[in-house]
């Protein structure tokens, strides 16, 4: 969804947490893949 109303501080915090979690998952997968490929 677009950001419109999602600018309040709690929604901003949740968005940050979601992005952090997503990046951690992606980087974790990449790391595992690199280890596997070695």
């Amino acid at each position: 969804h677009s950001d419109g109303i999602f600018t309040d501080s709690y929604s901003r915090y949740r968005k940050q947490m979601a992005v952090k979690k997503y990046l951690a998952a992606v980087l974790g997968k990449r790391y595992k893949q690199r280890v596997k490929n070695k």
């Epitope: 969804h1 677009s2 419109g4 109303i5 999602f6 309040d8 501080s9 709690y10 929604s11 915090y13 949740r14 968005k15 947490m17 979601a18 992005v19 979690k21 997503y22």
Partner: antibody, heavy 123, light 110 residues
Framework: EVQLVESGGGLVQPGGSLRLSCAAS????????MSWVRQAPGKGLEWIGI???????WYASWVKGRFTISRDNSKNTLYLQMNSLRAEDTAVYYC?????????????????WGQGTLVTVSS | DIQMTQSPSTLSASVGDRVTITCLAS??????LAWYQQKPGKAPKLLIY???TLASGVPSRFSGSGSGTEFTLTISSLQPDDFATYYC????????????FGGGTKVEIK
């Protein structure tokens, strides 16, 4: 079993204070945003506030500093400190776990609820 | 401040009926809406989130729809276990709000 159990409710005089506890089991409280919601007898659900994993808090506009949400992750327990209690604070108080946030859905929902604890404010 | 208005407040229906409950948001909340079921003396139970996604273990006779400011909860064929009170909740914001919940709809036996 994943559950929340509230305690600490009871009879309190107007102007008095009470601290409610919510013990979490089957999951780590530190990993979740948590909330308190209350329900006056025969009335609807009324949100009180939220504490996030960083211990930042958000409260309903009507709270006006009378209630404070905190947590002790070492005890896996959530708290609600209630001060300057009034007759209209008489209600069942529920703690609730909030949904995880995802990149394309960071809205908040109440996914797990305790059984509630009754607070009666009366002289 | 986002206000949630539910209608009707009470609904009389019979087993097998198709039941629809409406929830209106005072501003655009996109699809950030949940529905809960509550039975007397029990805690609420999450039924639907993200406006239309069924929570785990919820029967398929329940469905949710809508986006923006208007949302509906539909029970396709009312069962005896469905007589309860239903609440909508906006999940879009928590800054300076009075209450993210609607006022509730009691579904009673006709």
């Amino acid at each position: 079993e994943v559950q929340l159990v509230e305690s600490g409710g009871g009879l309190v005089q107007p102007g008095g204070s009470l601290r409610l506890s919510c013990a979490a089991s089957g999951f780590s409280l530190s990993s979740y945003d948590m909330s308190w919601v209350r329900q006056a007898p025969g009335k609807g659900l009324e949100w009180i506030g939220i504490i996030n994993t960083n211990d930042d808090t958000w409260y309903a506009s009507w709270v006006k500093g009378r209630f404070t949400i905190s947590r002790d992750n070492s005890k896996n327990t959530l708290y609600l400190q209630m001060n300057s209690l009034r007759a209209e604070d008489t209600a069942v108080y529920y703690c609730a776990r909030i949904s995880d946030a995802y990149v394309f859905d960071y809205a908040y929902y109440f996914t797990l609820w305790g059984q509630g604890t009754l607070v009666t404010v009366s002289s | 401040d986002i206000q949630m208005t539910q209608s009707p407040s009470t609904l009389s229906a019979s087993v097998g009926d198709r039941v629809t409950i409406t929830c209106l948001a005072s501003q655009n909340i996109y699809n950030s809406l949940a529905w809960y079921q509550q039975k007397p003396g029990k805690a609420p139970k999450l039924l639907i989130y993200r406006a239309s996604t069924l929570a785990s273990g919820v029967p398929s006779r329940f469905s949710g729809s809508g986006s923006g400011t208007e949302f509906t909860l539909t029970i396709s064929s009312l069962q005896p276990d469905d007589f309860a009170t239903y609440y909508c909740q906006q999940g879009a914001g928590a800054d300076n709000i009075g209450n993210p919940f609607g006022g509730g709809t009691k579904v009673e036996i006709k």
